[in-house]
Interface confidence: low
């Protein structure tokens, strides 16, 4: 995806996971200068901001995801020990200093480990 000099690549747009897994929401971007990266989470319950940061600086992680997420300077984030309630749409927006931006979405499906799956 590319817009106004910001390009964004999402290698895996849909991720299937089971509870308690650590999940990498992987992206790559390129743009002029140092952008602001923002991830938001949407589900049937609404939308909330997860984290916002400029690569090379400390991330501003929302209270709802404190200690549950870490950021990488390529724009990716890792979610720790996911639960079923983490299922939903994860939207990344990469914004250049002058305001141009691009967004992309990763869909995360988290399921319980069923007893029969263990046999």
């Amino acid at each position: 995806l590319q817009s106004q000099g910001v390009s964004l690549y999402i290698p895996q747009a849909t991720i299937n996971a089971t509870v308690k897994e650590d999940i990498l929401l992987s992206v790559e971007y390129s743009c002029h200068g140092v952008p602001t990266i923002e991830w938001t989470y949407s589900s049937n319950w609404g939308t909330q901001k997860i984290v916002e940061w400029k690569p090379g600086t400390q991330a501003n992680i929302s209270q709802s995801h404190k200690d549950r997420v870490c950021t990488f300077d390529n724009g990716s984030i890792q979610l720790f020990s996911v639960g079923v309630r983490d299922s939903g749409y994860y939207v990344i927006t990469v914004t250049e200093r002058l305001g141009s931006s691009q967004f992309g979405t990763i869909v995360l499906h988290v399921s319980e480990i069923l007893y029969e799956d263990l046999h």
């Epitope: 927006t93 250049e96 305001g99 141009s100």
Partner: antibody, heavy 121, light 111 residues
Framework: EVQLVESGGGLVQPGRSLRLSCAAS????????MHWVRQAPGKGLEWVAV????????YYADSVKGRFTISRDNSKNTLYLQMNSLRAEDTAVYYC??????????????WGQGTLVTVSS | QPVLTQSSSASASLGASVKLTCSLS???????IAWHQQQPEKGPRYLMK???????SKGDGIPDRFSGSSSGAERYLTISSLQSEDEADYYC?????????FGGGTKLTVL
């Protein structure tokens, strides 16, 4: 439910000033960039100004640059537009709009109902 | 700075489908846009954000009858099963380096 309610419009003489307000509710106001967009009678939409979530970045349309100032008070969940040196061509309905994101001027996922500003002698 | 071009008017029959077009100026074919609807005497309403590859994210409560697609520098809004309340002005919008740009709007009449 997200609500944006504009106020402060009215009839004003050319060269005078006016301040518009937009009261926001139903979302975390301090987390999102906010815009003003206007619509002259019978015309299309024209973007006026944007301010980032924390007020650190502001951008203006060329037509209002140097005359209008956008600001916000996150403690009051309120967006402002200070309009100075008003001209007849500033006559329009002024809409407050919420950006989808915090920093970037991208697009608006919620709009207010607007307040009418009429500049006439 | 990008320029967005829209037809000034369009019409279609109740229950039919209509496809509105927004054209990006030369050199801006990769830009994402948004579509907004403005019913008579009301404020605008956000419909969707539309990427150059056709992927889109819709606003809260926007019916499935509204969909977006892209081809080159063209961005489309398709409304199927037209209803009387779809009669409105439709604006496309894009964003760039500290600026916002609107198309001139398309007035949709439902016959």
């Amino acid at each position: 439910e997200v609500q944006l309610v504009e106020s402060g419009g009215g009839l004003v003489q050319p060269g005078r000033s006016l301040r518009l307000s937009c009261a926001a509710s139903g979302f975390t106001f301090s987390s999102y960039a906010m815009h003003w967009v206007r619509q002259a009678p019978g015309k299309g939409l024209e973007w006026v100004a944007v301010i980032s979530y924390d007020g650190s970045n502001k951008y203006y349309a060329d037509s209002v640059k140097g005359r209008f100032t956008i600001s916000r008070d996150n403690s009051k969940n309120t967006l402002y537009l200070q309009m100075n040196s008003l001209r007849a061509e500033d006559t329009a309905v002024y809409y407050c709009a919420k950006d989808q994101y915090s920093v970037g001027a991208t697009t608006y996922d919620y709009w207010g109902q607007g307040t009418l500003v009429t500049v006439s002698s | 700075q990008p320029v967005l071009t829209q037809s000034s008017s369009a019409s279609a029959s109740l229950g039919a489908s209509v496809k509105l077009t927004c054209s990006l100026s030369s050199g801006h074919s990769s830009y994402a846009i948004a579509w907004h609807q403005q019913q008579p005497e009301k404020g605008p309403r956000y419909l969707m954000k539309l990427n150059s590859d056709g992927s889109h994210s819709k606003g809260d409560g926007i019916p499935d009858r509204f969909s977006g697609s892209s081809s080159g520098a063209e961005r489309y809004l398709t409304i199927s099963s037209l209803q009387s309340e779809d009669e409105a002005d439709y604006y496309c919008q894009t964003w760039g380096s500290g600026i916002q740009v609107f198309g001139g709007g398309t007035k949709l009449t439902v016959l």
